[in-house]
């Protein structure tokens, strides 16, 4: 607001006030008058720039008189009463109401007072966030959008994340009229290791009091990943029975493992329980490469693990799981 | 009904002075300020000041600063300009009108002649 | 001060013709023009305050537009009963000054 007048009679105003499209907004203006000096308001008048006319009067013995009478209306000026206060009521916000309004006080005896103020048209756009659900590419693809709607003025995404990538933003306009909608589209290239990881995306506009932020949980569809682990190079005759574990990561889940040697079938020491497979004891040395192969919607690997069973006692701390 | 009702003709010589007077009726006459305007014969209007009842606050034309006292007597709701040191040129009907911004009421005229 | 400057000084035309006044301001004035009508030996009645807005009772024949420094006054079918003198008035500031009138004849 600007400072009050020294000695003279000062129209009060705020320089900019926002208003939402489609609601209403009051643009506020005052007439203050310093205690030893004395005025007469006889008219309060609104006009636009660059239109011609004024779009609201406010006269001492006609009262109101707007140029759209449907959206105007003086707030405070009532005949009858000291017209100090001209602010002004806007109904229906449209686009085309964004602009420069002077607000005027026809004063006695100091003459004409104005301010001039500014009305932001905004719209709050709503905000979505979404996964691209990706295979292994090989080359940056959109992993991750973000779509503010029906903005005024667009609103600004921005994409944090440990993980790197780049933001690719586009606007067009919205649904109403003078509105934009933004979408930014969070790019990578596409790894299991990202898979189930999290991005956030940061959405900020002039109608927020805060910025939103939308967390977006990243999907990579992949094969399996396969190792085998149980094997500690370390197994002895006579020793009792020991698991491996087929250990697979994929998205989306393994539908189903498949034990093998590089021979062929398992031989009869070796069971197969799902992801696991089951060593029983054995009474003679065994050097044995195992396969183990994991299948998902999307392939099938696998992995492969050479065990030796060997000769000599067992150490109180061999590899093998004792029952 | 608003009226303004203005004091009758004067004749004055050259350098004499002329005070006209305006008395209202059919509003609060403090609530709105009184202004006079004149016109000489065939010719355009001329504002020459005013004056706000409530506070006594005065605004006069330059051209007549010096010679024009605008004033009045809230008892009677009555305005009056007295206009000094008078010329031939001062020659023409006197308006007092109650202004909004604009005037939306004035006087009958009252027309005064300045002449040796 | 600020010069009004209006034209025609005087006009003749037919009743229901379309009349044009112009007022032009030597400076923006904004919206803070009045328009007067002044039949011989009568004082001026006001029409139009802030340029466009008609005083209630005042014939819908009669409109005022402009803003800044130009300004127009319209009578859109001229009846008998519109014979005077018009004047347009600016109230931006002291001293409020008046166009030097035009006079309206009828044909």
């Known amino acids: 607001w600007p400072p009050p007048g020294t000695g003279d009679v000062v129209v009060q105003a705020p320089t900019q006030v926002p208003g939402f499209l489609g609601d209403s907004v009051t643009l506020p203006c005052y007439l203050q008058v310093p205690n030893m000096e004395v005025t007469h308001v006889s008219q309060l008048t609104w006009a636009r720039h660059g239109e011609s006319g004024s779009m609201a009067v406010f006269h001492q013995t006609q009262g109101p008189s707007y140029s759209e009478s449907k959206r105007l209306e003086f707030v405070a000026a009532r005949l009858g009463a000291e017209l100090r206060n001209a602010s002004l009521r806007m109904f229906g916000l449209r686009v085309e109401d964004e602009g420069n309004y002077t607000c005027l006080f026809v004063t006695f005896p100091q003459g004409s007072r104005s301010v001039d103020i500014w009305l932001r048209v905004l719209a709050k756009p709503q905000n979505t966030a979404e996964v691209q659900k990706v295979q292994l590419t090989g080359e940056p693809v959109p992993m991750a959008r973000c779509v503010s709607t029906g903005g005024r003025p667009p609103a600004q995404i921005t994409w944090h994340s440990d993980l790197g990538g780049m933001p690719n933003t586009s606007q067009v306009p919205g649904f109403l009229s003078g509105t934009v909608t933004v979408t930014s589209l969070w790019i990578l290239v596409p790894s299991s290791q990202v898979d189930g990881k999290n991005v956030t995306c940061k959405v900020e506009h002039e109608s927020f009091e805060k910025p939103q932020l939308l967390t977006v949980n990243l999907t990579v569809y992949y094969p399996p990943e396969v190792s085998i682990s149980g094997y500690d190079n370390n197994w002895y005759l006579g020793q009792n029975e020991a698991t491996l574990t087929c250990d697979a990561r994929s998205n989306p889940e393994p539908t189903g493992y498949n034990w093998s040697t590089t021979m062929g079938p398992l031989p009869p020491f070796a069971v197969a329980q799902g992801a696991q497979l089951l060593i029983r004891p054995v009474d003679k040395p065994i050097n044995t490469t195992l396969i183990c192969n994991v299948t998902n919607a999307l392939g099938a690997r696998q992995a492969e693990l050479t065990v030796q069973v060997k000769e000599g006692p067992p150490s109180e701390h061999s590899g093998i799981s004792r029952n | 009904e608003v009226q303004l009702v203005q004091s009758g003709s004067e004749l004055k010589k050259p350098g004499a002075s002329v005070k006209v007077s305006c008395k209202t009726s059919?509003?609060?006459?403090?609530?709105?300020?009184m202004h006079w305007v004149r016109q000489p014969h065939g010719k355009g209007l001329e504002w020459i000041g005013g004056?706000?009842?409530?506070?006594?606050?005065?605004s006069y034309n330059q051209r007549f600063k010096g010679r024009v006292t605008i004033t009045v007597d809230k008892s009677t709701s009555t305005a009056y300009m007295e206009l000094s040191s008078l010329r031939s040129e001062d020659t023409a009907v006197y308006y007092c009108?109650?202004?909004?911004?604009?005037?939306?009421?004035w006087g009958q005229g009252t027309l005064v002649t300045v002449s040796s | 001060d600020i010069q009004m400057t209006q034209s025609p000084s005087a006009m003749s035309a037919s009743v229901g013709d379309r009349v044009t006044i112009t007022c032009k301001a030597s400076?923006?004035?904004?919206?803070?023009v009045a328009w007067y009508q002044q039949k011989p030996g009568q004082p001026p009645k006001a029409l139009i305050y802030?340029?466009?807005y008609r005083y209630s009772g005042v014939p819908d024949r009669f409109s005022g537009s402009g803003s800044g420094t130009d300004f127009t006054l319209t009578i859109s079918s001229l009846q008998a009963e519109d014979l005077a003198e018009y004047f347009c008035?600016?109230?931006?500031?002291?001293?409020?000054?008046f166009g030097q009138g035009t006079k309206l004849e009828i044909k």
């Open positions: 008035q600016q109230y931006e500031s002291y001293p409020y000054t």
């Open positions: 802030s340029a466009s």
């Open positions: 009108a109650r202004w909004t911004g604009d005037f939306d009421y």
């Open positions: 400076q923006n004035v904004g919206t803070n």
């Open positions: 059919g509003y609060t006459f403090t609530e709105y300020t």
């Open positions: 004056i706000h009842p409530n506070s006594g606050g005065t």
